[in-house]
């Protein structure tokens, strides 16, 4: 099989996250996001900071960006919603939902992810799955077929040491270790799922990839019901 | 359709500078890394550095640190090369690269008084 | 540092020969990248993550290896297959190339 990584992952088995999304400007992948409802994508906000004077599109049901399959599809985008206090210059509240032109079309390679509302933090050590169409290795290059990789959950403190992020790991943050294995240029916007529950979104802050001391940083999603709920009501 | 179009052919003094420019087109720099790659006549291809354009962060091959500076401008979609020092073993053709997948055509550079 | 050597130095092969050549690490690898080189023009790279053919090249290039032995074959020589092939590690920084081997045709 080929050897291409997330940084350190595999190629994913096809259709097997059938949440998963890419967020597209002018037709090249840009982007991760995950299907939280029939007509809605989470991704993260710093994805459309240049994306002004271009056409933003979901792809839904993809395992290769390029070839042809039956379950995929692009679909307009109707509304873009960034968190309002998202800012281009901090990592905090870096998420975005985006409104469908219609209901996707479901089916066995593309279903909506069971998103956490409880509002609490996942214990240290826990294996998550992040997946995306981002980076996979040190020279930079883009793959075309979906890859996916297990990371250990960091605990925050750790994660906040002067040698790591240095506190800027909010509460509403969490952060997966990065040793080889990591999330990377264009996974931003992507799932971090916690058995088969969407815990976290891939930051799109400028970070050093797959190195151990700057740990992967993630949104939690639990911590923004309350906003998620008001947008998909 | 992706290109990289590299900066001319260059004659500069010992000890001086030279900055090379590498401008992309038909893709977005900072979506990957940018690499610089020395060629040698008979001495085959070094690795220089890379930059990611998004954020501005460089590695280097300690053996080129402190004489080689990679930058990026994304709003011109352009890399930079910058030699500093120049002695008659930078005599090269540099090359940059795009996730080392598409390559510019190079620019020779010769150091000579 | 890991350092790539790549064997032989130069070979040669008549049209329709099968070529093999070799790139081995001073300690191992995950993957390895193989670039193909013509006199007066750029790299051009042939194979990533070990065995995947980047997009144009043709099949009759193939490429294998794990740990610290790496090789990249040809099945069948062609005339514009002649040229210069670097290997090059991206699993360990520095990432670096190999000295090259450079291939004839006969």
């Known amino acids: 099989p080929p050897r291409g990584r997330i940084l350190g992952g595999r190629e994913a088995e096809a259709h097997a996250r059938p949440y998963m999304a890419s967020v597209q400007l002018n037709g090249a992948h840009l982007c991760g996001g995950v299907l939280v409802a029939e007509q809605w994508v989470l991704s993260a906000a710093h994805c459309l900071e240049d994306a002004a004077d271009g056409k933003v599109q979901v792809l839904l049901g993809a395992h290769s960006l390029s070839q042809p399959e039956p379950s995929k599809r692009l679909y307009d985008v109707l509304r873009a919603v960034p968190h309002p206090d998202s800012q281009p210059d901090t990592i905090d509240h870096d998420l975005l939902l985006l409104q469908l032109s219609e209901k996707a079309t479901l089916g066995p390679a593309v279903r909506p992810l069971p998103w956490q509302r409880v509002d609490r933090d996942v214990a240290p050590g826990t294996l998550c799955d992040v997946a995306g169409w981002g980076i996979v290795n040190h020279a930079g290059r883009r793959p075309d077929s979906l890859q996916h990789v297990l990371l250990p959950v960091l605990d925050r403190a750790t994660c906040n040491r002067r040698t790591h992020h240095d506190g800027a790991i909010t509460e509403r943050l969490m952060c997966a270790e990065s040793n080889r294995r990591d999330s990377c240029k264009g996974d931003s916007g992507g799932p971090l799922v916690c058995g088969g529950v969407l815990e976290g979104v891939v930051t799109s802050g400028s970070r050093v990839c797959g190195n151990r001391k700057k740990p992967g940083i993630y949104t939690r999603v639990a911590s923004y019901a309350a906003w998620i709920d008001s947008v998909l009501a | 359709e992706v290109q990289l179009q590299q900066s001319g052919a260059e004659l500069v003094k010992p000890g001086a500078s030279v900055k090379l420019s590498c401008t992309a087109s038909?893709?977005?720099?900072?979506?990957?890394?940018m690499h610089w790659v020395k060629e040698r006549p008979d001495q085959g291809l070094e690795w220089i550095g890379r930059?990611?354009?998004?954020?501005?962060?460089?590695k280097y091959d300690p053996k080129f640190q402190g004489k080689a500076t990679i930058t990026a401008d994304t709003s011109s979609n352009t890399a930079y090369l910058q030699l500093s020092s120049l002695t008659s073993e930078d005599t090269a053709v540099y090359y940059c690269?795009?996730?080392?997948?598409?390559w510019g055509q190079g620019t020779s550079v010769t150091v000579s008084s | 540092q890991i350092i790539l050597t790549q064997s032989p130095a130069i070979m040669s092969a008549s049209p329709g020969e099968k070529v093999t050549m070799t790139c081995s690490a001073s300690?191992?690898?995950?993957?390895m990248y193989w670039y193909q080189q013509k006199p007066g023009s750029s790299p051009r790279l042939l194979i990533y993550?070990?065995?995947n053919l980047a997009s144009g090249v043709p099949v009759r290039f193939s490429g294998s290896g794990s740990g610290a032995s790496y090789s990249l074959t040809i099945s069948r020589m062609e005339a514009e297959d002649a040229a210069t092939y670097y290997c090059?590690?991206?699993?360990?920084?520095?990432?670096?190339f190999g000295g090259g081997t450079k291939l004839e045709i006969k």
């Open positions: 690269a795009n996730a080392m997948d598409y």
């Open positions: 038909g893709f977005k720099i900072k979506d990957t890394y």
């Open positions: 930059i990611d354009p998004a954020n501005g962060n460089t």
């Open positions: 300690s191992s690898v995950s993957n």
């Open positions: 993550d070990t065995s």
């Open positions: 090059q590690q991206w699993s360990s920084y520095p990432w670096t």
